[in-house]
Amino acid sequence: KSSNEATNITPKHNMKAFLDELKAENIKKFLYNFTQIPHLAGTEQNFQLAKQIQSQWKEFGLDSVELAHYDVLLSYPNKTHPNYISIINEDGNEIFNTSLFEPPPPGYENVSDIVPPFSAFSPQGMPEGDLVYVNYARTEDFFKLERDMKINCSGKIVIARYGKVFRGNKVKNAQLAGAKGVILYSDPADYFAPGVKSYPDGWNLPGGGVQRGNILNLNGAGDPLTPGYPANEYAYRRGIAEAVGLPSIPVHPIGYYDAQKLLEKMGGSAPPDSSWRGSLKVPYNVGPGFTGNFSTQKVKMHIHSTNEVTRIYNVIGTLRGAVEPDRYVILGGHRDSWVFGGIDPQSGAAVVHEIVRSFGTLKKEGWRPRRTILFASWDAEEFGLLGSTEWAEENSRLLQERGVAYINADSSIEGNYTLRVDCTPLMYSLVHNLTKELKSPDEGFEGKSLYESWTKKSPSPEFSGMPRISKLGSGNDFEVFFQRLGIASGRARYTKNWETNKFSGYPLYHSVYETYELVEKFYDPMFKYHLTVAQVRGGMVFELANSIVLPFDCRDYAVVLRKYADKIYSISMKHPQEMKTYSVSFDSLFSAVKNFTEIASKFSERLQDFDKSNPIVLRMMNDQLMFLERAFIDPLGLPDRPFYRHVIYAPSSHNKYAGESFPGIYDALFDIESKVDPSKAWGEVKRQIYVAAFTVQAAAETLSEVA
């Protein structure tokens, strides 16, 4: 049967009808509506928006739309005691203070409740001391400082530029180096693209612009006070001293005008090489401390933010499936923003809104998807993926038994150059096939497919004629679904040209200047890129919910497993003496990957041939596909990261945003030459190879014939 017959609908109600219903003008209208005032998590404004979305999703035709609330730990600046950084002279007088707020953009001068720039979850404190410039504060930057340059950060305040890695990793690294405070700043080298004007005249970051953001190291825990369990009315909460992932030293972000004032006086060591220099007219000296004339001056931080248990609200909409109502395809993105959320998240939320409207239109005409579709507007993503994680913790038993797929829908754009997709290998073929059917919005590709423009602009480094698809990392709401629960996940958005624009993210990320006008004037005036992203996200959801056989290809997992096994083996072989001494063998992993490859191939052959009119066999084959991602979950989790349970992928221990393959083995090998007990360290490598090999073999066996 076709999917139309399976769901008792007229043939016109197919993917084309759904896609044709999506309109750029609606996305534009929704974006405007969502961005006129701030929607900070835990505020009345964001609660009101939740209720508005609930009401509109009901109007659009969903079967039910409910609010799911949780009481989680959030962080806010003290309204009467602002955060700032000073340069103080030998008498303790403040001779320079950083700004207390960003100059508001034109038209927003009278908007209230714009939260000033702050690092969410920073502890309170007023440390003072000498400054050390630590580049991006990456693991390798601290290795360079401590091992090569013999610079000790203990008792120092470090200043790090934003970019390259998640800010929480920067703070963790600074803490481990013994720093007593962290100043984060946006360097023009990373947040000011050459030849583009500053906002409001262009999409670049002005000198007074500042990136907000949380600095947690949650490792997938969700609410810091209720790890593993929902923060509901009867929750047992940890004391603040036992909370997960909180930083122990004060942290504060600044813009490049203020950074200039701090960095221009730096003395001490010169930067080790050009990769430590940004674009400010300062020497980028590492320190510690200020140069000659200013050597008696110190830096002092004044941080007075508070952590507060606060109510948050997710909106959960349901479109019940006609044939398999107990199989869930989830489309989710967050609603909370740091300020106006012009890009993050409302460019994504507007797309979700239009997707819901289109599905609702079809439903009102008598159509239903084969499987149930759940739509989610998550709260408190910016405070550590809290809304999505708490909901998943509350519903984990249902999700692990019924979850088919999760499609994430944060920012639809971070540029307007080409498509960017990160997903499980199970979705590669779905994404390829879908983008071949969609029109490219790109100039110079009129009449061509999205697949063609994407492949041309972002080619795969391994397979010619195919586009790049990246590994899932974290830093967004798919984390709990993929990394903890093992539900096949994916995300798509339009991105910049990474070749020519080497700045990190987009320049106005998490600043007050992320407005509706930023998008409408500079990124996507016709909203054609938003529409394309809506077609990709919506099309994926449609196919996942409506195709008779799930659109997952397990052979693509086999291909990447081989690649990842090769990569980790090559890393390990860089220590041949220890490999030989400790008899470290990858034989079990390569054998498991070989078995997986053969079994996946046979499964795919059976998938072509089986009787799709037999509902029991169909369900059995689909369940094998659905549960394959689940089979990569280790219930014990990764070492010291119990909520990262996927054995093939985890967020990098050095950058939450990046995905790492065979993370257990990778982390065991990382910097192994510096370990005090090599025998123990190589023993852990061997154990991680064993866990990985076992998991791959066990996953392979889930694809074998059942009896």
Partner: nanobody
Framework: EVQLLESGGGLVQPGGSLRLSCAAS????????LSWVRQAPGKGLEWVSS????????DYADNVKGRFTISRDNSKNTLYLQMNSLRVEDTAVYYC??????WGQGTLVTVSS
């Protein structure tokens, strides 16, 4: 039983070239990544290069990058190392390695004028 047999070593002048081979048997050759490792006289083992299973990804130590090329012929169950622009410091016994624990007996490369 896994067997790895290296050949192709010898004496060569600086700037010269050699091609090492490693004939493999006793296992499914195309299912394994393979490596070359060397040991200079009086020194420890040093990784040189690795290649993925199916003619896949290659990786090189910094000091041989651009001079050495690893390759494999799965139909002949053979691994190769093409060494160009050889230097005196490349003098070593070169070993073929499968999965980290199976090593060949090595072939000696001497670079000397």
């Amino acid at each position: 039983e896994v067997q790895l047999l290296e050949s192709g070593g010898g004496l060569v002048q600086p700037g010269g070239s050699l091609r090492l081979s490693c004939a493999a048997s006793g296992f499914s050759f195309s299912s394994y990544a393979l490596s070359w490792v060397r040991q200079a006289p009086g020194k420890g083992l040093e990784w040189v290069s690795s290649i993925g299973e199916n003619d896949g990804t290659t990786d090189y130590a910094d000091n041989v990058k651009g001079r050495f090329t690893i390759s494999r012929d799965n139909s002949k169950n053979t691994l190769y190392l093409q060494m160009n622009s050889l230097r005196v410091e490349d003098t070593a016994v070169y070993y073929c390695v499968k999965d980290g624990v199976h090593w060949g007996q090595g072939t000696l490369v001497t670079v000397s004028s």
